[in-house]
């Protein structure tokens, strides 16, 4: 048959951050091509990345339609130049991915401190509300729009002159913290979804310190 040298895809892996979602697999193709299909548990299969020699497929457009759904993908293997050919059972070779629920599993991207403003002994630290590729009414939603109060941020802050750290949490994108007058502080934030059991925390944001560009000081 024409499928003699065709091998099934394996190690199907979802790579997803802030809902940007790519399915990856192995092996690098030798004389074969791949097509990916994706569906929800109750939905129809939709084909993507037709007859590709890549070993990844961007499925973001499909999963953002409903990030709370659970998705399954499968990767079909075809002989290069003979994509009509089927396996011995009359079906092309394919392998299923693990199930993937974007809302529960997408990684939280590294947050960014948008600004901080000092007024006397208070500092307001604002976290950038990152835009996702999830849409509602033709507009892209932010991370906060999607997760609502399920998303919190943890702030770490410390005096530039010392190593002793403090922490604060917020269920918005802003922190209002007390600081000692005349001291410079450094800040780093982390996104957290406390209700999750996996992929709960982001990596820390880059550290921002008072006396640098992003800050503003008022007596």
């Amino acid at each position: 048959s024409g499928t003699t040298n065709t091998v099934a895809a394996y190690n199907l892996t979802w790579k997803s951050t802030n809902f940007k979602t790519i399915l990856e697999w192995e092996p690098k193709p030798v004389n074969q091509v791949y097509t990916v299909q994706i569906s929800t548990k109750s939905g129809d299969w939709k084909s993507k990345c037709f007859y590709t020699t890549d070993t990844e497929c961007d499925l973001t457009d499909e999963i953002v339609k409903d990030v709370k759904q659970t998705y399954l993908a499968r990767v079909f293997s075809y002989p290069a130049g003979n994509v009509e050919s089927t396996g011995s059972a009359g079906e092309p070779l394919y392998e299923n991915s693990p199930e993937f629920t974007p809302y529960l599993e997408t990684n939280l991207g590294q947050p960014t401190i948008q600004s901080f403003e000092q007024v006397g002994t208070k500092v307001n630290v604002t976290v950038e509300d990152e835009r996702t590729l999830v849409r509602r009414n033709n507009t892209f939603l932010s991370l906060r729009d999607v997760f609502g109060k399920d998303l919190i941020y943890t702030l770490y802050y410390w005096k530039s002159s010392s190593s002793g750290k403090k922490t604060a949490k917020t269920n918005t994108n802003e922190f209002l913290i007390d600081v000692d007058k005349g001291e410079n502080y450094c800040f780093s934030v982390q996104a957290v979804i406390p209700s999750r059991t996996v992929n709960r925390k982001s990596t820390d944001s880059p550290v921002e310190c008072m006396g640098q560009e992003k800050g503003e000081f008022r007596e």
Epitope: K166, T167, N171
Partner: antibody, heavy 117, light 107 residues
Framework: EVQLQQSGTNLVRPGALVKLSCKGS????????MHWVKQRPEQGLEWIGG????????MYDPKFQGKASITADTSSNTAYLQLSSLTSEDTAVYFC??????????WGQGTSVTVSS | DIQMTQSPSSLSASVGDRVTITCKAS??????LSWYQQKPGKAPKLLIY???SLADGVPSRFSGSGSGTDYTLTISSLQPEDFATYYC?????????FGGGTKVEIK
């Protein structure tokens, strides 16, 4: 099943130091925050400090700064509390607890430390 | 630092009574408040998280309410196993602070 298993009872001399351990099972400590809480006999609960095992950040109540040192070893899924220059004031039960972000949701069984000459 | 004032420090009640314990924070803690039950010789047990959410396995007679600076734990109908000490904890900002505790005793 999520569990926090703490090390055993300690009887130590004044001026000594002690290192308490708290081994997590059923979860990965670097996905959470780990805290230590002190309870003296017949007294309330006092937060000593906490640690984010993912990045090594540790925070302390100012009254325990210099007394306590909180660390974590992600390879063994264990959090540690070291107490130095022990006095009778440090005689207490010490609890470790996991912080989900919403609460300290799981607690160890407690470790008793008695400082006596 | 945020102070947590818990009241009453003790109360006597009968089985079936409705019991209310309050915690007042010295500043807004944005619902980062949890409630714990502790029995002698045991570790604290989580009852309520994020001010109003019931922890897994906790009977529905326990409920939490409040926001901003004022929070309440209610036991709608006290049961024999509920006689214990109760603590609130604010974890919105370090240093985290516990309330002083409320000992619920049998009348």
């Amino acid at each position: 099943e999520v569990q926090l298993q703490q090390s055993g009872t300690n009887l130590v001399r004044p001026g000594a130091l002690v290192k308490l351990s708290c081994k997590g099972s059923g979860f990965n400590i670097k996905d959470y925050y780990m805290h230590w809480v002190k309870q003296r006999p017949e007294q309330g609960l006092e937060w000593i400090g906490g640690n984010d095992p993912a990045n090594g950040h540790s925070m302390y109540d100012p009254k325990f700064q210099g007394k306590a040192s909180i660390t974590a070893d992600t390879s063994s899924n264990t959090a540690y509390l070291q107490l130095s220059s022990l006095t009778s004031e440090d005689t207490a039960v010490y609890f470790c607890a996991r912080d989900s972000g919403y609460a300290m949701d799981y607690w160890g069984q407690g470790t008793s430390v008695t400082v006596s000459s | 630092d945020i102070q947590m004032t818990q009241s009453p420090s003790s109360l006597s009640a009968s089985v079936g009574d409705r019991v209310t314990i309050t915690c007042k924070a010295s500043q807004d803690i944005k619902s980062f408040l949890s409630w714990y039950q502790q029995k002698p010789g045991k570790a604290p047990k989580l009852l309520i998280y994020y001010a109003t959410s019931l922890a897994d396995g906790v009977p529905s007679r326990f409920s939490g309410s409040g926001s901003g600076t004022d929070y309440t734990l209610t036991i709608s109908s006290l049961q024999p196993e509920d006689f214990a000490t109760y603590y609130c904890l604010q974890h919105g900002e370090s240093p985290y602070t516990f309330g002083g505790g409320t000992k619920v005793e049998i009348k």
